[in-house]
């Protein structure tokens, strides 16, 4: 069967530019190695935000310079994206790939619309 991936429709980043959401997948197979990728869709262009491969039961490891962090629990991944600004508002898509053992499966969520509002600068005080 095709793999289903679920994620929230909308998330609001906090005042520090941090947004978190859960990406949940229904695994058709017994995967031991999973790859999670966050994609950003703006207009019709899709770009990769970050990606991590993890062993089931272990933590996700993103690259040191990644703006993403995450934790996994069963078929659920808790993703956090930081350093967001108003211009980063957009649709963030969770892609899950069951890499090992074969067969390979891929699932793509419908996307989470992340809204980012830049904080107002503090007024000067005399």
């Amino acid at each position: 069967k095709a793999m289903h991936v679920a994620q929230p429709a909308v998330v609001l980043a906090n005042s520090r530019g941090i947004a978190s959401f859960v990406c949940e997948y229904a695994s058709p197979g017994k995967a031991t190695e999973v790859r999670v990728t966050v994609l950003r869709q703006a207009d019709s262009q899709v770009t990769e935000v970050c990606a991590a491969t993890y062993m089931m039961g272990n933590e996700l490891t993103f690259l040191d310079d990644s703006i993403c962090t995450g934790t996994s629990s069963g078929n659920q991944v808790n993703l956090t994206i930081q350093g967001l600004r108003a211009m980063d508002t957009g649709l963030y898509i969770c892609k899950v790939e069951l890499m090992y053992p074969p067969p390979y499966y891929m699932g793509i969520g419908n996307g989470t619309q992340i809204y980012v509002i830049d904080p107002e600068p503090c007024p000067d005080s005399d």
Epitope: K1, A2, M3, H4, P28, E33, T37, L39, V46, T47, E48, T53, K95, M99, Y100, P102, P103, Y104, Y105, M106, G107, I108
Partner: antibody, heavy 118, light 107 residues
Framework: EVQLVESGGGLVKPGGSLRLSCAAS????????MNWVRQAPGKGLEWVSS????????YYADSVKGRFTISRDNAKNSLYLQMNSLRAEDTAVYYC???????????WGQGTMVTVSS | EIVLTQSPGTLSLSPGERATLSCRAS??????LGWYQQKPGQAPRLLIY???TRATGIPDRFSGSGSGTDFTLTITRLEPEDFAVYYC?????????FGQGTKVEIK
């Protein structure tokens, strides 16, 4: 310009070997999974093999398993297919194809012809 | 292995007419289905992915629909350059599989 260019095809006898290459340009090759797809004369498309961006995960069609080996060299922006124990039914145009971020094969090379005949 | 069956095998139409191509999967592929166009002597070109999203640079006369096991590619007004072979492909699981193709020829 995003481009894939295959080479290495030719005429080989049954049981022989051949190594195909695919040179990538115009995109960050090391970020994408890659595939080989073949097309026998007058026939449809058949997926042959896939390799992940870092070569950690490799998949083969049952028809080539144990005979073909896919590999890549990210430093050289190149994809390879080592074909051993070739059979007449391996005669086809071989295409390399990039896996797009959303899953389909979004960029294809022009193909290289492999003929297995005595 | 997921088997994709395309119909009809050949479609004979005139420029300006509407083409409707079908692709049926042996089991659900959700929306992980793409459509490709191939002209003689050329490589396939991605037209549609995600069952209904046009790839970059594809004119809006091409549209895709469907989910699960039944999919359709529609070309609203055939242009001379649209006469070609069209393949569907599922990319949700390995082995990646293609349909046998539908040839759209000039009537």
């Amino acid at each position: 310009e995003v481009q894939l260019v295959e080479s290495g095809g030719g005429l080989v006898k049954p049981g022989g070997s051949l190594r195909l290459s695919c040179a990538a340009s115009g995109f960050t090759f090391s970020s994408y999974s890659m595939n080989w797809v073949r097309q026998a004369p007058g026939k449809g498309l058949e997926w042959v093999s896939s390799i992940s961006s870092s070569s950690s995960y490799i998949y083969y069609a049952d028809s080539v398993k144990g005979r073909f080996t896919i590999s890549r060299d990210n430093a050289k922006n190149s994809l390879y297919l080592q074909m051993n124990s070739l059979r007449a039914e391996d005669t086809a145009v071989y295409y390399c194809a990039r896996v797009g971020l959303m899953g389909p094969f979004d960029i294809w090379g022009q193909g290289t012809m492999v003929t297995v005949s005595s | 292995e997921i088997v994709l069956t395309q119909s009809p095998g050949t479609l004979s139409l005139s420029p300006g007419e509407r083409a409707t191509l079908s692709c049926r999967a042996s089991q659900s592929v959700s929306r992980y289905l793409g459509w490709y166009q191939q002209k003689p002597g050329q490589a396939p070109r991605l037209l549609i992915y995600g069952a209904s999203t046009r790839a970059t640079g594809i004119p809006d006369r091409f549209s895709g629909s469907g989910s699960g096991t039944d999919f359709t590619l529609t070309i609203t007004r055939l242009e001379p350059e649209d006469f070609a072979v069209y393949y569907c492909q599922q990319y949700g699981s390995s082995p990646w599989t293609f349909g046998q193709g539908t040839k759209v020829e000039i009537k």
